[in-house]
């Protein structure tokens, strides 16, 4: 099994539409479960937008350039979430995300309809077939959504902005 | 064949030192995060430490948390668990476990044979 | 930390009966529960995975279900061999986390 999601970050405005993108190969002739999965930061991202980061953050990460202090914890210390899953053309909402126009569309991309300010976080396509438990069956996308300042100065480097 | 060969383990007193290591082979070591985990004498199944593909990345419940550490030697294909200040409540077998996935949440597909450790006085 | 709960630590049944043990969740894992097997002197044994999804090369004989908080292991038809503890496993959120296990005993 192999996943991919080829947007590594994605920058989407407020109350805007955006599509977090999945593609996935199995060697598994039956049907695939996919589910997208919401990870908030390990700590706040928009203190580090507005360049408030703190320095031990900086200099831990500095020093270890595998490990990112708003991405690396255990799930247990940040919010989990379902956000969508789909098995054969039903696609079932997460709890959380009831009542919110979000699907997933093209097998597996989540299509999401007006971003909230909660939104902002780590998106997971995650693959699930029968047959198929060696390779890779998660992969990932961090998603920021910001409000229409006007202003592009704000933004996180290295982030593709996305403005519709 | 993924093989996975723990050692290390032995009877030590509370205060003391171990360190065990997993031999692997039969799979890119490098690829994958890996696990110990440990059974109590009551037979309960607890996770001790995992490690990133990389090794840049670990982490410990509270309860071994400043005393264990996990490391790995992807030249070696070999992962450790350096245990000190020892409590007989470490006392269990320790096993070395690797998901199926190598990257993704998937269970323990590859379990090592254990190696004991027993802290007593 | 998510709590996997095993009500039943032990469970008598007789070679040919149908056997269910089951595990609740503190909160949704979704589908993402695990089963394994372990005998006496060895590891545990991968046998279900993703709630309902067999391990390769594992009998048919061995079905889960679940999703949510309430999930299910069976085996239709007990073997004198399935004698093990069978615990029950979440791979849903680290830290990944175990039930305290089922002792089956064949009478």
């Known amino acids: 099994l192999q996943v991919t999601v080829p947007d590594k970050k994605k920058v989407a405005m407020l109350f805007q539409p955006t599509v977090l993108r999945c593609h996935f190969s199995t060697s598994s002739h039956q049907p695939a479960v996919v589910q997208w999965k919401f990870k908030s930061y390990c700590q706040d991202r928009m203190g580090e937008s507005l360049g408030m980061s703190s320095t031990r953050a900086q200099s831990l990460s500095k020093r270890n350039l595998e490990w990112d202090p708003y991405l690396d914890c255990l799930d247990s210390r940040r919010t989990v979430r379902v956000v969508a899953s789909k098995q054969g053309s039903t696609v079932t909402l997460g709890d959380f995300y009831r009542g919110r126009e979000i699907t997933i569309v093209h097998d597996a991309d989540l299509q999401i309809g007006k971003l909230m300010w909660g939104d902002s976080g780590l998106y997971y396509c995650i693959i699930t077939t029968p047959d198929d438990l060696e390779g890779k069956n998660e992969d990932s996308v961090e998603l920021l959504v910001l409000g229409r300042t006007g202003l592009l100065a704000d933004l996180l480097p290295s982030f593709a902005v996305e403005i519709m | 064949e993924v093989k996975m060969v723990e050692s290390g383990g032995g009877l030590v007193q509370p205060g003391g030192s171990l360190k065990l290591s997993c031999a692997t082979s039969?799979?890119?070591?490098?690829?994958?995060?890996m696990y110990w985990v440990r059974q109590t004498p009551e037979k309960r199944l607890e996770w001790v430490a995992y490690?990133?593909?990389?090794?840049?990345?670990?982490y410990y419940p509270d309860t071994v948390k400043g005393r264990f550490t996990i490391s790995r030697d992807n030249a070696k294909n070999t992962l450790y668990l350096q245990m000190s200040r020892l409590k007989s409540e470490d006392t269990a077998m320790y096993y070395c476990?690797?998901?199926?996935?190598?990257?993704?949440?998937?269970?323990?597909?590859?379990w090592g044979q254990g190696t004991l450790v027993t802290v007593s006085a | 930390d998510i709590v996997m709960t095993q009500s039943h630590k032990f469970m008598s049944t007789s070679v040919g009966d149908r056997v269910s043990i089951t595990c609740k969740a503190s909160?949704?894992?979704?589908?993402?529960v695990a089963w394994y097997q372990q005998k006496p002197g060895q590891s545990p044994k991968l046998l279900i995975y993703?709630?309902?999804y067999r391990y390769t090369g594992v009998p048919d004989r061995f079905t889960g279900s679940g999703s949510g908080t309430d999930f299910t292991f069976t085996i239709s038809s007990v073997q004198a061999e399935d004698l093990a503890v069978y615990y029950c496993?979440?791979?849903?959120?680290?830290?990944?986390?175990f039930g305290g296990g089922t002792k089956l005993e064949i009478k």
């Open positions: 476990a690797r998901q199926g996935y190598y990257y993704g949440s998937s269970p323990f597909a590859y």
């Open positions: 039969g799979f890119t070591f490098s690829d994958y995060y």
């Open positions: 490690i990133s593909n990389g090794g840049g990345s670990t």
């Open positions: 909160q949704d894992v979704s589908t993402a």
């Open positions: 993703s709630a309902s």
């Open positions: 496993q979440q791979h849903y959120s680290t830290p990944y986390t």
